[in-house]
Interface confidence: low
């Protein structure tokens, strides 16, 4: 699982891996926001989120080390599309609270809470340059997390954060086909907290998908699914308060 | 080429405010963040926190929360740190620096700004 | 907050020397290390990202290691240009911090 890329690169070919140093490495923020292993989210960098950007107010201590803080519940009627913060793929323009189907910009879930586990649908599949935003909260003492993006009864990338395999935290990224799965490719970069606010971003690249966690850069997978028209459902599931699964063009 | 031109040195009083801009070029200013960097005379590098180029967003460390403040004026690609009432100890050198591809790592520097403050 | 602990804080050498010089990080930093150069009244320039990754333009003779908590940049055959003070720096989590730096000088 490479960690090499950039929206700039993905949107010029340029082949800059980070550009808002997705802080690291896609988009506009430092990758360390807060929360590899071994570190815990620093409480003591709160910021400040954009006017306008997350409705609703962070609670106290909401991942306050990544750029902008998280919210609370949005306000009521309020159906966030991605976060305009410090995201790895900042979206062309400026980002929008919009509508669960806006005529353009992001697609997904009205702001939650959604019950877990949640099926997003994808109508169409997947294609290049879509990003798939999701933002939530890790519950306390979690065990996992999966995101599984299915072709029918296949899952072309699942994407599963353990919090505790044998005394270790670990993501392992993994395709079924025909209910057998194939070989896991692991990464021990683990940037999810038990009880901690997040951000997962999913770039569809034409050749993998880009993974990006509290805006930084955190691995690629191939496609082993290569009919992406027909990846059409997003399942989430596992250990967390989901507060929004939405889409976007980029 | 990748280039952060930073505005020239300062002499302050202790109290006066000082605002030093850095001005980058050779790249799109809002895909990369961009931090701020002090260096006392004859000291090592201290990181000063860094403002979200898309989003405006600053983040300050611990130590320059107050009065700090980092802004931009994305039509000029253009960074700027803002010191407010300031102290002797804020005698230094200021960097800016872009965030590069990779986690945490900031891969082209301003040529610095020195600030001296002196009654 | 993560500390980084730069050793030795100077060191002399002779030209075509290899010289070594370690960072060590109070907790596991993963691979999220950088190295930069500072030679005397000049700016910090990047060498090396993500711990062993050199930076465009960087000469090979500069190499880096590690992961953890324990990483090293070594420069093999010593040049004059390489006289200047050396900083790591994690990236692993706010605040990002600096190691105190090694000055290197020629014997």
């Known amino acids: 699982m490479a960690d090499n890329f950039s929206l700039h690169d993905a949107l010029s070919g340029s082949g800059n891996p980070n550009p808002q140093g997705w802080p690291g490495a896609w988009g506009n923020q430092p990758a360390g926001a807060g929360g590899y292993p071994g570190a815990s989210y620093p409480g003591a960098y709160p910021g400040q989120a954009p006017p306008g950007a997350y409705p609703g107010q962070a609670p106290p201590g909401a991942y306050p080390g990544a750029p902008g803080a998280y919210p609370g519940a949005p306000a009521p009627g309020v159906y966030p599309g991605p976060p305009s913060g410090p995201g790895a793929y900042p979206s062309s323009g400026q980002p929008s609270a919009t509508g669960a189907y806006p005529a353009t910009g992001p697609y997904g879930a009205p702001a939650g809470p959604l019950i877990v586990p949640y099926n997003l649908p994808l109508p169409g599949g997947v294609v290049p340059r879509m990003l798939i935003t999701i933002l939530g909260t890790v519950k306390p003492n979690a065990n996992r997390i999966a995101l599984d993006f299915q072709r029918g009864n296949d899952v072309a990338f699942h994407f599963n954060p353990r919090f505790n395999e044998n005394n270790r935290r670990v993501i392992v990224c993994n395709t079924k086909l025909d209910n057998n799965w194939g070989r896991e490719e692991r990464q021990s970069v683990f940037p999810f907290e038990s009880g901690k606010p997040f951000k997962i971003q999913v770039l569809v690249e034409p050749d993998h998908f880009k993974v990006a966690v509290n805006d930084a850069h955190l691995l690629q997978y191939n496609h082993r699914v290569k009919k992406l028209n027909e990846i059409s459902k997003l399942g989430i599931s596992g250990d967390i308060d989901l507060t929004s699964a939405s889409y976007t063009m980029i | 080429q990748i280039q952060l031109v930073q505005s020239g040195p300062e002499v302050k009083k202790p109290g006066e405010t000082v605002k030093i801009s850095c001005k980058a070029s050779?790249?799109?200013?809002?895909?990369?963040?961009m931090n701020w960097v002090k260096q006392a005379p004859g000291k090592g590098l201290k990181w000063m926190g860094w403002?979200?180029?898309?989003?405006?967003?600053?983040t300050y460390t611990d130590d320059f929360k107050g009065r700090f403040a980092f802004s931009l004026e994305t039509s000029a690609s253009t960074a700027y740190l803002q010191i407010n009432n300031l102290k002797n100890e804020d005698t230094a050198t200021y960097f800016c620096?872009?965030?590069?591809?990779?986690?945490?790592?900031?891969?082209?520097w301003g040529q610095g700004t020195s600030v001296t403050v002196s009654s | 907050e993560i500390k980084m602990n730069q050793s030795p804080s100077s060191l002399s050498a002779s030209l075509g020397d290899t010289i070594t010089i370690t960072c060590h990080a109070s907790q596991n930093i993963n691979v999220w290390l950088s190295w930069y150069q500072q030679k005397p009244g000049n700016i910090p320039k990047l060498l090396i990202y993500k711990a062993s990754n050199l930076h465009t333009g960087v000469p090979s003779r500069f190499s880096g290691s590690g992961s953890g908590t324990g990483f090293t940049l070594t420069i093999s055959s010593l040049q004059p240009e390489d006289i200047a003070t050396y900083y790591c720096?994690?990236?692993?989590?706010?605040?990002?911090?600096f190691g105190g730096g090694t000055k290197l000088e020629l014997k």
């Open positions: 720096q994690q990236g692993q989590s706010y605040p990002y911090t």
């Open positions: 403002i979200n180029t898309y989003t405006g967003e600053p």
């Open positions: 620096a872009k965030f590069g591809n990779y986690v945490g790592a900031m891969d082209y």
């Open positions: 050779g790249y799109i200013f809002t895909n990369y963040g």
